[in-house]
Amino acid sequence: TPEVWVQVRMEATELSSFTIRCGFLGSGSISLVTVSWGGPNGAGGTTLAVLHPERGIRQWAPARQARWETQSSISLILEGSGASSPCANTTFCCKFASFPEGSWEACGSLPPSSDPGLSAPPTPAPILRAD
């Protein structure tokens, strides 16, 4: 069974800047990754970035830099200023569309006791939905 992991990290240098890393643990070919916050995409969540492995990357504020880290993982840096900036208990979700497994999504947030610059290891998060 495929799994999605989500890691949220607060940057030590900018306390309101976050890095979200997501990965897909499966054998299929990833066709699209959607990163959202405030809940799953399409269920009250707001899209921050969309990453296609060949067509490119689109992102919207407060997302600052979305990128592919490997063929099965991505990272997203969020700006920390302004009304739309994330807070410590913000939930971030990553949805991986893959062939032939379908869509798999998981969410994560900053660990409650995390010090700036530290985060929980990127273990698989609970799978919320498989379309």
Partner: antibody
């Protein structure tokens, strides 16, 4: 079938504003961002910006900041672009195109003339 | 901004001939994480919107004839039409799909002798 239907040609005076539309059908409007592209007569293509219908978030080409404003109406699955303080340099065909540029509208011709 | 430079600006070939056109970017379009090039090619016929031919530098969009082939990596890319047909009369544009703003080349106009 994905379709992007753009509004008709506009003849406007210098200094005025114009707002054109791009009505999407055949897919879930909020699932895909919308791009806008300018093509002056006989010239190449210029990316103006894009809008995320999911939350109204926008990205602009710095060259078009202050010139173009992108909005959406989710209830009618329509994207809009307003151009302000028009000059002859703004005379062009303007296209909407769904994210990744696989689907394009037919274009709206804007002519700025006194 | 990434500058996209296309050459030649125009070319004239006979039906059945092979044609190649070049596109160079001022910065690399390679996504190092997944080793994909974010470059697209479009065909624009007179009075029509552009049509996506190739994305990811070499992947043909659905429905595009296999006589169209994209190749290249980093900053140097090529579009090849293996056997030109009369309906290929058009202007061909490359596009940086890597970084905003998503700039286009100035185009290569293909004429049929």
């Amino acid at each position: 079938e994905v379709q992007l239907q753009q509004s008709g040609p506009e003849l406007v005076k210098p200094g005025a504003s114009v707002k054109m539309s791009c009505k999407a059908s055949g897919y879930t409007f909020t699932d895909y961002s919308m791009n806008w592209v300018k093509q002056s007569h006989g010239k190449s293509l210029e990316w103006i910006g894009d809008i995320n219908p999911n939350n109204g978030g926008t990205n602009y080409n710095q060259k078009f900041k202050g010139k173009a404003t992108l909005t959406v109406d989710r209830s009618s699955s329509t994207a809009y672009m307003e151009l302000r303080s028009l000059t002859s340099e703004d005379s062009a065909v303007y296209y909407c195109a769904r994210v990744w540029f696989a689907y394009w509208g037919q274009g709206t011709l804007v002519t700025v003339s006194a | 901004d990434i500058v996209m430079t296309q050459s030649p600006s125009s070319l004239s070939v006979s039906e059945g001939e092979k044609v190649t056109m070049s596109c160079k970017s001022s910065q690399s379009l390679l996504s190092s994480g997944n080793q994909k090039n974010f470059l697209a090619w479009y065909q624009q016929k007179a009075g029509q919107p552009p049509k996506l031919l190739i994305y990811g530098a070499s992947t043909r969009e659905s429905g595009v004839p296999d006589r169209f082939t994209g190749s290249g990596s980093g900053t140097d890319f090529t579009l090849t039409i293996s056997s030109v047909q009369a309906e290929d009369l058009a202007v061909y544009y490359c596009q940086n799909a890597h970084s905003s703003p998503f700039t286009f080349g100035s185009g290569t106009k293909l004429e049929i002798k």
